[in-house]
């Protein structure tokens, strides 16, 4: 007996050929012999089956010898070992239909978990072996569960349901809710002005919710609320703002902030949160703010940052294309009677300059000069 | 709804080989037959053959000896190429799905063939 | 190959008139016929198949009826968005063949 394996809501041919490469009369039974089609010359007959609505052939090919079943939008239940009568023979053929299907909402928060439920007919035994995005590969039974999400697990799951030596093959889209980077470090020099982006790692239709900045500054003994805004079909509207600092807020995705001056005061780490409407639990997104400070005073040259630094990070005083005069991992460094001439204060990692200030230091009769 | 998006090189020379794809989207794949049909001023609708999921092809016997058609079930698609064209090939080709009626099309790729 | 002919090639009508347009094929095709409509620019669309039955989403105005070798699509009361050119195509045996279409223009 010939096993086809079909998909839940798919279309499946199941084929019955005769030795006679005309149009001649054939019947499709099911397993209590109920007609579902046949024909009557050329005309195609249907029985009183239940997939009277959902059964079809191809008149095309009768003149072939082939007298095919194509049954639309599979059912669980259309399961069953389906007879061809053709030239006083009978060929069997068992369709076993499954269905995959993810167990919740496809759109995921970062860090939840997946569940996939295979429905199939009863009797079968079939295994199912699924690949991520990234190559991870999960087998199970009846349900596959994948914890922890990353964002590396958006995109085309593809699931192979194993019955009888035959495969079926299911795609199932998966996005995995996050912003694009789980961190990330803003260098600024004191008085810019301060860009805070945070991408989306994923593009819906509608996106509703509300968000909310947490600001944790380095000279602060507890963390305050910066701002809360809602998100209404991809608008941003403001709900509340501190009055200092007088965070703006963009319209428009991707969430961006702007902080007027970069200051000491406000150097430190923040923790945007997102809640979006029908979802438990909130994407979040760190993002710190390192700030720098280059000062004179009498003869005492200076350079101090504030904020969360790496301690493999070098700040260093130098006077314009010369030798480092100072270099420390520290988070100040100064210079005693500097000599004239544009001093550069640097932050820097392994080599790369991440922040830089440059100071004009005049001879000792005048006032230093802060470009 | 089952979407269909097709390409393919829009201006050819005499003698060269057209070739088109198709992408199915949003539907089952298995089970249809996934056709190509041109339309020219000239000759109205043509249809030129079909393929199925297995690979099993029906053409026109009128274009038989320069049409291929074939099918990547990794990615839902399916191709035509028509060898040695001529000027008389000229005309907006369509993909379409089929089982007995053409119930989904996709949305037309002119092609021109000129020296 | 089964050869359809389409009549009239154009008719010119007003809204709210009741049209008739006939296809013909060389041989009995039983009832493997289908009727499309097609609007400038864009593909054929499916109105009718197995001679009568309607695709879903198509208005109740239009009808087909006809067997063997006779065919026939009835729009009951023209709407201004109904004139565009129609196709009958058979689906008895390869090829399939189409209808030369009649174009339905506003008188």
């Known amino acids: 007996k010939k096993v086809v394996l079909g998909k839940k809501g798919d279309t499946v041919e199941l084929t019955c050929t005769a030795s006679q490469k005309k149009s001649i009369q054939f019947h499709w039974k099911n397993s209590n012999q109920i007609k579902i089609l046949g024909n009557q010359g050329s005309f195609l007959t249907k029985g009183p089956s239940k997939l009277n609505d959902r059964a079809d052939s191809r008149r095309s090919l009768w003149d072939q010898g082939n007298f095919p079943l194509i049954i639309k939008n599979l059912k669980i239940e259309d399961s069953d070992t389906y007879i061809c009568e053709v030239e006083d023979q009978k060929e069997e053929v068992q369709l076993l239909v499954f269905g995959l299907t993810a167990n919740s909402d496809t759109h995921l928060l970062q860090g939840q978990s997946l569940t996939l439920t295979l429905e199939s007919p009863p009797g079968s035994s079939p295994s199912v072996q699924c690949r991520s995005p990234r190559g991870k590969n999960i087998q199970g039974g009846k349900t596959l569960s994948v914890s922890q999400l990353e964002l590396q697990d958006s995109g085309t799951w593809t699931c192979t349901v194993l019955q009888n030596q035959k495969k079926v093959e299911f795609k199932i889209d998966i996005v995995v809710l996050a912003f694009q980077k789980a961190s990330s470090i803003v260098y600024k020099k004191e008085g810019e002005q301060v860009e805070f982006s945070f991408p989306l790692a994923f593009t819906v239709e509608k996106l509703t919710g509300s968000g909310e900045l947490w600001w944790q500054a380095e000279r602060a003994s507890s963390s305050k609320s910066w701002i809360t805004f809602d998100l209404k079909n991809k608008e941003v509207s403001v709900k509340r703002v501190t009055q200092d600092p007088k965070l703006q807020m963009g319209k428009k995705l991707p969430l961006h902030l702007t902080l007027p001056q970069a200051l000491p005061q406000y150097a430190g780490s923040g923790n945007l949160t997102l809640a979006l409407e029908a979802k438990t639990g909130k994407l979040h997104q760190e993002v710190n703010l390192v700030v720098m400070r280059a000062t004179q005073l009498q003869k005492n040259l200076t350079c101090e940052v504030w904020g969360p630094t790496s301690p493999k990070l070098m700040l260093s005083l130098k006077l314009e294309n010369k030798e480092a005069k100072v270099s420390k991992r520290e988070k100040a460094v100064w210079v005693l009677n500097p000599e004239a001439g544009m001093w550069q204060c640097l932050l820097s990692d392994s080599g790369q300059v991440l922040l830089e200030s440059n100071i004009k230091v005049l001879p000792t009769w005048s006032t230093p000069v802060q470009p | 709804q089952v979407q269909l998006q097709q390409w393919g090189a829009g201006l050819l020379k005499p003698s060269e080989t057209l070739s088109l794809t198709c992408a199915v989207y949003?539907?089952?794949?298995?089970?249809?037959?996934w056709s190509w049909i041109r339309q020219s001023p000239g000759k109205g609708l043509e249809w030129i053959g079909e393929?199925?999921?297995?690979?099993?092809?029906n053409y026109n016997p009128s274009l038989k000896s320069r049409v291929t058609i074939s099918v990547d079930t990794s990615k839902d698609q399916f191709s035509l190429k028509l060898s040695s064209v001529t000027a008389a090939d000229t005309a907006v080709y369509y993909c379409?799905?089929?089982?007995?009626?053409?119930?989904?099309w996709g949305q037309g790729s002119l092609v021109t063939v000129s020296s | 190959d089964i050869q359809m002919t389409q009549s009239p090639s154009s008719v010119s009508a007003s809204v709210g008139d009741r049209v008739t347009i006939t296809c013909r094929a060389s041989?009995?095709?039983?009832?493997?016929l289908a009727w499309y409509q097609q609007k400038p620019g864009n593909a054929p669309k499916l109105l009718i198949y197995?001679?009568?039955s309607f695709q879903s989403g198509v208005p109740s105005r239009f009808s087909g009826s006809g067997s063997g070798t006779d065919f026939t699509l009835t729009i009951s009361s023209l709407q201004t968005e109904d004139f565009a050119t129609y196709y009958c195509?058979?689906?008895?045996?390869?090829?399939?063949?189409f209808g030369q279409g009649t174009k339905l223009e506003i008188k």
């Open positions: 379409a799905r089929v089982i007995n009626w053409f119930d989904s």
């Open positions: 949003g539907g089952s794949f298995s089970g249809y037959y």
């Open positions: 393929i199925n999921q297995s690979g099993s092809t």
């Open positions: 041989q009995g095709i039983s009832s493997w």
């Open positions: 197995d001679a009568s």
């Open positions: 195509q058979q689906a008895n045996s390869f090829p399939y063949t």
